[in-house]
Interface confidence: low
């Protein structure tokens, strides 16, 4: 029986240029986390294996940065980095946990007003 | 308007120490995640701690053990105390907060204060 919860850092807007950590934190289970992934859409950006350590993706090595702890840092953000990320925690017994967060870049002139994004 | 100045850099000897601070204007410190990330010459920014509103901290395996993150809800500022400093540890070093007690860090950064280690 699965009875875990994944609380992650929600949705976030962060400035063009800038850098930012997505967060997730897997509670309310004693299940072993063996893997982590970090993924945006459809896109494989790293890999955290508790035997193996991190792996990042390739075509996102100069900008993705591992931790902090389990979570992953995304550096020089451009607007096309907005969108859904999810973390996805692979554990023994229960099995696999999702979170997901959605990310907004914006630009510079519009984050230095405040301005943040929200789902109604 | 929200605002993260830092102070506290300077020249230091190797196995020296030296605290920064960041005081956080427009905000508390206590309801927003904190944290500091670095900038060697010639390198891209790296993340090197931070704090969260429910007082956890998180730090790259380079500086673990030898710095420490810690805020101070009274004064409203954000601590990053570095002990035996290394060479490598030379660069700018940057306060980040956040716009909401719900996101990450880095999408409100400080002016950055230098960090020098050298004999």
């Known amino acids: 029986m699965m009875t875990g919860t994944i609380e992650t850092t929600g949705n976030i807007s962060a400035e063009k240029g800038g850098s930012i950590i997505l967060q997730c934190h897997l509670s309310s289970t004693t299940a072993q986390v063996t893997q982590v992934n970090w993924e945006q859409q459809d896109q494989l950006l790293a890999i955290c294996n508790a035997d193996l350590g991190w792996h990042i993706s390739p075509s996102f090595k100069d900008r993705v940065a591992p931790g902090p702890g389990l979570g992953l840092t995304l550096q020089s953000l451009t607007v096309n980095d907005t969108g859904e990320y999810f973390c996805i925690y692979h554990t023994y017994p229960d099995g696999t946990y999702t979170g997901r967060i959605f990310l907004e870049v914006l630009e510079s002139s519009v984050a230095e007003h405040g301005a943040r994004f929200q789902i109604p | 308007e929200v605002q993260l100045v830092e102070s506290g850099g300077g020249l230091v000897q190797p196995g020296g120490s030296l605290r920064l601070s960041c005081a956080a204007s427009g905000r508390t410190v206590s309801s927003h995640a904190m944290g500091w990330f670095r900038q060697a010459p010639g390198k891209e920014r790296e993340f090197v701690a931070a704090i969260t509103s429910s007082g956890s901290t998180y730090y790259a395996d380079s500086v673990k053990g030898r710095f420490t993150i810690s805020a101070d809800n009274s004064k409203n500022t954000a601590y990053l105390q570095m002990n035996s400093l290394k060479p490598e540890d030379t660069a700018v070093y940057y306060c980040?907060?956040?716009?909401?007690?719900?996101?990450?860090?880095?999408?409100?950064w400080g002016q950055g204060t230098l960090v020098t280690v050298s004999s």
């Open positions: 980040a907060s956040s716009y909401s007690s719900s996101s990450g860090l880095g999408d409100i």
